[in-house]
């Protein structure tokens, strides 16, 4: 899932110390087994590094081998490094696991840039800072890769949390979360709070910091403020949703809403940027440029290539607009909007300028495969992947970066007609043509 561009992580701003973060249940949550109770053990279980993804600690095999695994809602394979690689500190050693079973089947996953390939098997898997369960899951043991692992990222594998339809080599390979729900009493739901730093972190700061939380099987109310608003999952492959309107500083982009979802719109923790279809990207950039016209930035900045630097502490957040995405609501003709700040879509970049400077990359980019609501969006919000009810919830994250004047927001309801028309129907093609890596 676009492993080249990922967003920065941060200690949980605004969160209480671990022991004080007790979840509060409200009557808005259904009373399902396992849904109630404390998720304290899962709070703050993610780490990460600027632009390189959020990872959770997992154990594989018997005796357990500990690995850091990238949390990716934009793919569906559990795949781990299983051979020496210059960028890996450690890797899964199948021969040391008494519970490993070989499926005698290979898997090859090409990305737009790069690829990985490996051998399929199953083994026992658990998440130390997750539910107290162990499951037998499919594992792709990566034996060869190109431009997949990232030097210094500190993760050794990927946990694809999307649906079986996009699993490789085909949809018969059960994804990890499906196995977890089938084999345990964990409810069919997980939630993510990704905490962007707002400033770059060096390696030691990352290892000592908190990157956020993956709550498996429930919702932790300490991780968000306000209400959760839900949008339907349009189709269970990626986490596909429908955007019905886009505003820049309250100004409607006034495009046919089908354009916003051409050819799909997905929520993807494994992609850094907010990625927009070409026409939408061009209109959005034009509008953002107009809103910030007191300053002029180089062409390469808007392409996400050049960095713009300000003297430390003087970044003029106020000249950059807020961006609102309206999502289809659960009720007919009702939508809600999520609003992000420049603190989310300007990504701090480390090790470039002097300590006297704060440097940023523009983290909105062009896509040829639809809208990707990557970490740029997710870092503003607590995102609930309610698979059981086929919906995704958004609430303002307790750790999002903001300033004294503006904050990220989730607001509704708004009346929006004919929202079903906003979805794009992808022509049926041979499944082998499905593109991985979302260029």
């Amino acid at each position: 899932t676009q492993h080249g561009i990922r967003l920065p992580l941060r200690s949980g701003l605004g969160g209480a110390p671990l022991g004080l973060r007790l979840p509060r249940e409200t009557d808005e949550e259904p009373e399902e087994p396992g849904r109630r109770g404390s998720f304290v053990e899962m709070v703050d279980n993610l780490r990460g590094k600027s632009g390189q993804g959020y990872y959770v600690e997992m154990t594989v095999g018997s005796p357990p081998q500990t690995l850091n695994i990238l949390v990716d809602t934009g793919s569906s394979n559990f795949a781990v490094g299983a051979a020496p690689h210059p960028f890996l500190h450690r890797y899964y050693q199948r021969q040391l696991s008494s519970t490993y079973r070989d499926l005698r089947k290979g898997v090859y996953v090409p990305y737009t840039q790069g690829k990985w390939e490996g051998e399929l098997g199953t083994d026992l898997v658990s998440i130390p800072h997750g539910p107290n369960v162990t499951v037998r899951a499919n594992i792709a043991a990566i034996t060869e890769s190109d431009k997949f692992f990232i030097n210094g990222s500190n993760w050794e594998g990927i946990l694809g949390l999307a649906y079986a339809e996009i699993a490789r080599p085909d949809d018969s390979l059960e994804p990890f979360f499906d196995s977890l729900v089938k084999q345990t009493h964990v409810p069919n739901l997980f939630s993510l709070q990704l905490c962007g730093a707002g400033f770059p972190l060096n390696q030691s700061e990352v290892l000592a910091s908190v990157g956020g939380s993956m709550i498996i099987g429930g919702i932790d109310h300490s991780l968000y403020t306000g209400s959760l608003w839900y949008t339907p999952i349009r189709r269970e492959w990626y986490y596909e949703v429908i955007i019905v309107r886009v505003e820049i500083n309250g100004q409607d982009l006034k495009m046919d809403c089908k354009e916003y979802n051409y050819d799909k719109s997905i929520v993807d923790s494994g992609t850094t940027n907010l990625r927009l279809p070409k026409k939408v990207f061009e209109a959005a950039v034009k509008s953002i440029k107009a809103a910030s016209s007191t300053e002029k930035f180089p062409d390469g900045f808007w392409l996400g290539e050049q960095l713009v630097c300000w003297q430390a502490g003087t970044t003029p957040w106020n000249i950059f607009p807020v961006i609102s995405l309206y999502l289809m609501g659960e009720v007919t003709n009702q939508s809600f909007r999520i609003t992000i700040l420049p603190q989310q879509y300007l990504r701090p970049v480390e090790d470039v300028a002097t300590s006297q400077d704060d440097c940023y990359k523009f983290a909105i980019s062009q896509s040829s495969t639809g809208t990707v609501m990557g970490a740029v969006i997710m870092e503003g919000f607590y995102v609930v992947f309610d698979r059981a009810r086929k919906r995704i919830g958004f609430a303002v994250s307790a750790c999002h970066v903001h300033d004294e004047f503006r904050t990220a927001a989730v607001e509704g309801p708004f009346v929006t007609l004919d929202m079903e028309d906003c979805g794009y129907n992808i022509p049926q093609t041979d499944e082998s043509t499905l593109m991985t890596g979302r260029a």
Partner: antibody
Framework: QLQLQESGPGLVKPSETLSLTCTVS??????????WGWIRQPPGKGLEWIGS???????WYNPSLKSRVTISVDTSKNQFSLKLSSVTAADTAVYYC????????????WGRGTLVTVSS | EIVLTQSPATLSLSPGERATLSCRAS??????LAWYQQKPGQAPRLLIY???KRATGIPARFSGSGSGTDFTLTISSLEPEDFAVYYC??????????FGGGTKVEIK
């Protein structure tokens, strides 16, 4: 054809303020496609960026000079100016004004430069 | 801070020879690098931008290559008017402010 011409005193006393003006001819300083900048070069040494300005008056300065530099623009006169306060002998240099073009990134057009000597 | 190191400091060549000038960045600057030529008593002149694109009016004997951290300016066959000082500049971080120390191309 657009041209840039620096003007100002060639001699400034230590602790005083150096003031230079760049006049743009053959084109408009109000173009949205360009920034305008000042670069200096001490005798026998390399190039040092001082700062840049946009038509709106938005400025960017070299952090090492920021506390002493002011760059301003006068669109009615098609000019932009440099003021450098509290000068010392280390500020003796040829001062160039330049246009920042090619995607607002490169100094694609330069003035001829003017030598400013700081001496009592 | 990104530091640009140019080498050699001086290059002694004869007219008609090929000149190869190097500019190394302390970290990647993608392709956001320019080359300028400065003759004695004159202002610098933009030769190459975006690492390999020739500026308007620059002869074809000047070419730029490289990306990331290593860049090269090549003058395929030196003309008498090419003997000058050459500077590289990175604009990966903006505003544009970092120049290399320069390479002097002199007549042998």
């Amino acid at each position: 054809q657009l041209q840039l011409q620096e003007s100002g005193p060639g001699l400034v006393k230590p602790s005083e303020t150096l003031s230079l003006t760049c006049t743009v001819s053959g084109g408009s300083i109000s173009s949205s496609s360009y920034y305008w900048g000042w670069i200096r070069q001490p005798p026998g040494k390399g190039l040092e960026w001082i700062g840049s300005i946009y038509r709106s008056g938005s400025t960017w300065y070299n952090p090492s000079l920021k506390s002493r530099v002011t760059i301003s623009v006068d669109t009615s006169k098609n000019q932009f100016s440099l003021k450098l306060s509290s000068v010392t002998a280390a500020d003796t240099a040829v001062y160039y004004c330049a246009r920042v073009g090619h995607g607002i990134s490169y100094f694609d057009l330069w003035g001829r430069g003017t030598l400013v000597t700081v001496s009592s | 801070e990104i530091v640009l190191t140019q080498s050699p400091a001086t290059l002694s060549l004869s007219p008609g020879e090929r000149a190869t000038l190097s500019c190394r960045a302390s970290q990647s600057v993608s392709s956001y690098l320019a080359w300028y030529q400065q003759k004695p008593g004159q202002a610098p002149r933009l030769l190459i931008y975006d690492a390999s694109k020739r500026a308007t009016g620059i002869p074809a004997r000047f070419s730029g290559s490289g990306s990331g951290t290593d860049f090269t300016l090549t003058i395929s066959s030196l003309e008498p008017e090419d003997f000058a000082v050459y500077y590289c500049q990175q604009v990966y971080t903006w505003p544009p402010r970092t120049f290399g120390g320069g390479t002097k191309v002199e007549i042998k």
